[in-house]
Amino acid sequence: VEVQVSEDPVVALVDTDATLRCSFSPEPGFSLAQLNLIWQLTDTKQLVHSFTEGRDQGSAYSNRTALFPDLLVQGNASLRLQRVRVTDEGSYTCFVSIQDFDSAAVSLQVAAPYSKPSMTLEPNKDLRPGNMVTITCSSYQGYPEAEVFWKDGQGVPLTGNVTTSQMANERGLFDVHSVLRVVLGANGTYSCLVRNPVLQQDAHGSVTITGQPLTF
């Protein structure tokens, strides 16, 4: 028996369902009574789901997994993982034993889009050219960690005096805060781009300083 899985990682959004594809080629006359199927976390050997002795033994992993029972006899051993969490990320191995055996591993990459950044300025009044200001760009509830880029109004990257911190909340999602310290010119636009490297999703925020008032 030969087990096949997708070579590319499966990307799943937090709180959505994901399918980890696994298939085998049943011989003519194959019946489910012959099938032994085990899904396991590759790095820890934790049992996730199993089908043995002709029946689905159910989820051993927080009751959020399911097989496709009607498709098993056709060789579809895929696993459905419901309400994906950050902690589900990793490698899963599909083990199949009929008359002989095989196994293959598939990676699950979890992702969550970042919110549109909010921009704050400190100080936020009595600003004059030559003043040092702190611009903070904050974006929330994303995964995995973001890449943050700053540019001026001409699109020139600003790399000096940037401090970025990322903190995971109790669900494992990241809140990103990036601080740019800059000396004000006569006027100018400062934009922050928060990129999710897995989703290739960019979230933009900008602040324009033209004397008073400020434009966000």
Epitope: N36, D43, T44, K45, T52, T93, S97, D100, F101, A105
Partner: antibody, heavy 123, light 107 residues
Framework: QVQLVESGAEVKKPGASVKLSCKAS????????MHWVRQAPGQRLEWMGE????????NYNEKFKSRVTITVDKSASTAYMELSSLRSEDTAVYYC????????????????WGQGTLVTVSS | DIQMTQSPSSVSASVGDRVTISCRAS??????LAWYQQKPGKAPRLLIY???SLDSGVPSRFSASGSGTDFTLTISSLQPEDFATYYC?????????FGQGTRLEIK
């Protein structure tokens, strides 16, 4: 070639602890799960637990879970097994075993064995 | 835990004989079964994995079969170096468990 060299024989009193070592060579230490299997005189083999040296993850036989601790020192390519609250029934030969066939089976195949360490528990 | 039961517990045979050892699992284990040979004072040696696959270096006189709950190990023509104790092991579930062993003695 793969070699697993275990520490020497131990004699312990009931209630004491013993810590055995297993020095691995001939392969990349972090790439094979390491197991501990024991065999009391005239008895069947008994799996105690395992460790993934790459990430430190352990799985234990529930029978021993409260008494056994398996660790590794990656820099020394050495695995350790500590068994506490020893009793006379723990008298056995203790083997460390490396499993290079991890993807083949859901649990383990015991391919490379150490020479064994005799632990005698006696008052 | 999955119980593994071997039969017979011991068997006497002569060089050149054909010998069969059985192993039964208390629940279905597919083909995730291994066989080991152990000689006195030595560590066990893996002979068979996945119920029927010979490990490298194992002579072809050893063969094995089975799936589900019933498995057999066969030595087609006993050689002097085959007299030892043989163990089966299930590799599907934790805790990993072994049979009680079958001692193969010279008649």
């Amino acid at each position: 070639q793969v070699q697993l060299v275990e520490s020497g024989a131990e004699v312990k009193k009931p209630g004491a602890s013993v810590k055995l070592s297993c020095k691995a060579s001939g392969y990349t230490f972090s790439s094979y799960w390491m197991h501990w299997v024991r065999q009391a005189p005239g008895q069947r083999l008994e799996w105690m637990g395992e460790i993934n040296p790459g990430n430190g993850h352990t799985n234990y036989n529930e029978k021993f879970k409260s008494r056994v601790t398996i660790t590794v020192d990656k820099s020394a390519s050495t695995a350790y097994m500590e068994l506490s609250s020893l009793r006379s029934e723990d008298t056995a030969v203790y083997y460390c075993v490396a499993d290079p066939r991890r993807p083949k089976v859901p649990t383990a195949l015991f391919v490379y064995w150490g020479q064994g360490t005799l632990v005698t528990v006696s008052s | 835990d999955i119980q593994m039961t071997q039969s017979p517990s011991s068997v006497s045979a002569s060089v050149g004989d054909r010998v069969t050892i059985s192993c039964r699992a208390s629940q279905g284990i597919g083909t995730w079964l291994a066989w080991y040979q152990q000689k006195p004072g030595k560590a066990p040696r893996l002979l068979i994995y996945a119920a029927s696959s010979l490990d490298s270096g194992v002579p072809s006189r050893f063969s094995a079969s089975g799936s589900g709950t019933d498995f057999t190990l066969t030595i087609s023509s006993l050689q002097p170096e085959d007299f030892a104790t043989y163990y089966c092991q299930q590799a599907i579930n934790f805790p990993i468990t072994f049979g009680q062993g079958t001692r193969l003695e010279i008649k």
